[in-house]
């Protein structure tokens, strides 16, 4: 979490920062959508537990050439402590369930606001 | 339009149970946390527990812990405050309200209250 | 768990005075996310409390200006700048900070 400020950053990022702008980010998303999300890309569902950032990571690497989540991408990268490419799945994954980008990302919306409400941070 | 209204409060004999709900209207239950609050007559306010709908990760008031229990039933959109032992003490105004659904910083809306009478 | 303590429990006052009440938290009462969730809440008899500030000082829609909060770390105040009629009632300080959340006793604000 402490290179999540990028280079121009002055020092680390508190983890409840970092949480607070992506959710703002995902807020960012949500309230600027036009036209479908990501052309109503699916993506696999996950469980909204323990590692689910790299399992929301993992989901939403395979959507390609959609730039309104290309920071959500960056910035779940850094809450994820290994490297994750497309292609990737983890057991977190709901397997046998698809949705779209845009309720995929409501979904993490609400799970996120509710961890920083109650202080979960990492 | 968004609305909580409260039921099953009424007279209960000292040693027995009883089970509100909270029936909400105007949003989802599970975009929010849903709480508890009561006040006995004259006094004032007491935050007793809440939960979350979304996983059913409620909290509690030590102090009622073990005798209350909530939950919620997301179909029915409603949330409910199961109560086990009451004593005279019990007696009062019982609420639900909701948390805010953007960053959950406050209660916006309140149940008109239900009055639960514990004598015998 | 965190008392809250409110003060005066009761006063009497006249429409147009100025109302100072006070809420001290017995520690600190800002969350580790940052935020402090101190809330004031107004109740009539009869009634639901209703939310007039959040976050320490932050007004709620539709709650008129007069009402102001203001405080930080355990001592905190609610300002009603000029009493009107349909400002006598009780008021409730509240931290939504640490479970279990609590409640001031309450402020009984009367017409003298």
């Known amino acids: 979490l402490t290179c999540l400020g990028g280079f121009a950053s002055p020092g680390p990022v508190p983890p409840s920062t970092a949480l607070r702008e992506l959710i703002e980010e995902l807020v960012n998303i949500t309230q600027n959508q036009k036209a479908p999300l990501c052309n109503g890309s699916m993506v696999w569902s996950i469980n909204l537990t323990a590692g689910m950032y790299c399992a929301a990571l993992e989901s939403l690497i395979n959507v390609s050439g959609c730039s309104a989540i290309e920071k959500t991408q960056r910035m779940l990268s850094g809450f994820c402590p290994h490297k994750v490419s497309a292609g990737q799945f983890s057991s977190l994954h709901v397997r046998d369930t698809k949705i779209e980008v845009a309720q995929f990302v409501k979904d993490l919306l609400l799970h996120l606001k509710k961890l920083f409400r109650e202080g979960q941070f990492n | 339009e968004v609305q909580l209204v409260e039921s099953g409060g009424g007279l209960v004999q000292p040693g027995g149970s009883l089970r509100l709900s909270c029936a909400a209207s105007?949003?989802?239950?599970?975009?929010?946390?849903i709480h508890w609050v009561r006040q006995a007559p004259g006094k004032g306010l007491e935050w007793i527990g809440r939960i979350d709908p979304a996983n059913d990760n409620i909290k509690y008031d030590p102090k009622f812990q073990g005798r209350f229990t909530i939950s919620a039933d997301n179909a029915k959109n409603s949330a409910y405050l199961q109560m086990n032992s009451l004593r005279a003490e019990d007696t009062a105004v019982y609420y639900c309200?909701?948390?805010?659904?953007?960053?959950?910083?406050?209660?916006?809306?309140w149940g008109q209250g239900t009055l639960v009478t514990v004598s015998s | 768990d965190i008392q809250m303590t409110q003060s005066p429990s009761s006063l009497s006052a006249s429409v147009g005075d100025r109302v100072t009440i006070t809420c001290r938290s017995s520690q600190s009462i800002v969350h580790s996310n940052g935020n402090t969730y101190l809330e004031w809440y107004q109740q009539k008899p009869g009634k639901a409390p209703k939310l007039l500030i959040y976050?320490?000082?932050n007004r709620f829609s539709g709650v008129p200006s007069r009402f102001s909060g203001s405080g930080s770390g355990t001592d905190f105040t609610l300002t009603i700048s000029s009493l009107q009629p349909e400002d006598f009632a009780t008021y409730y300080c509240?931290?939504?900070?640490?479970?279990?959340?609590?409640f001031g006793g309450g402020t009984k604000v009367e017409i003298k």
């Open positions: 105007g949003f989802n239950i599970k975009d929010t946390y």
């Open positions: 509240f931290q939504g900070s640490h479970i279990p959340y609590t």
């Open positions: 309200a909701r948390s805010e659904e953007n960053w959950y910083d406050f209660f916006d809306y």
């Open positions: 976050k320490v000082s």
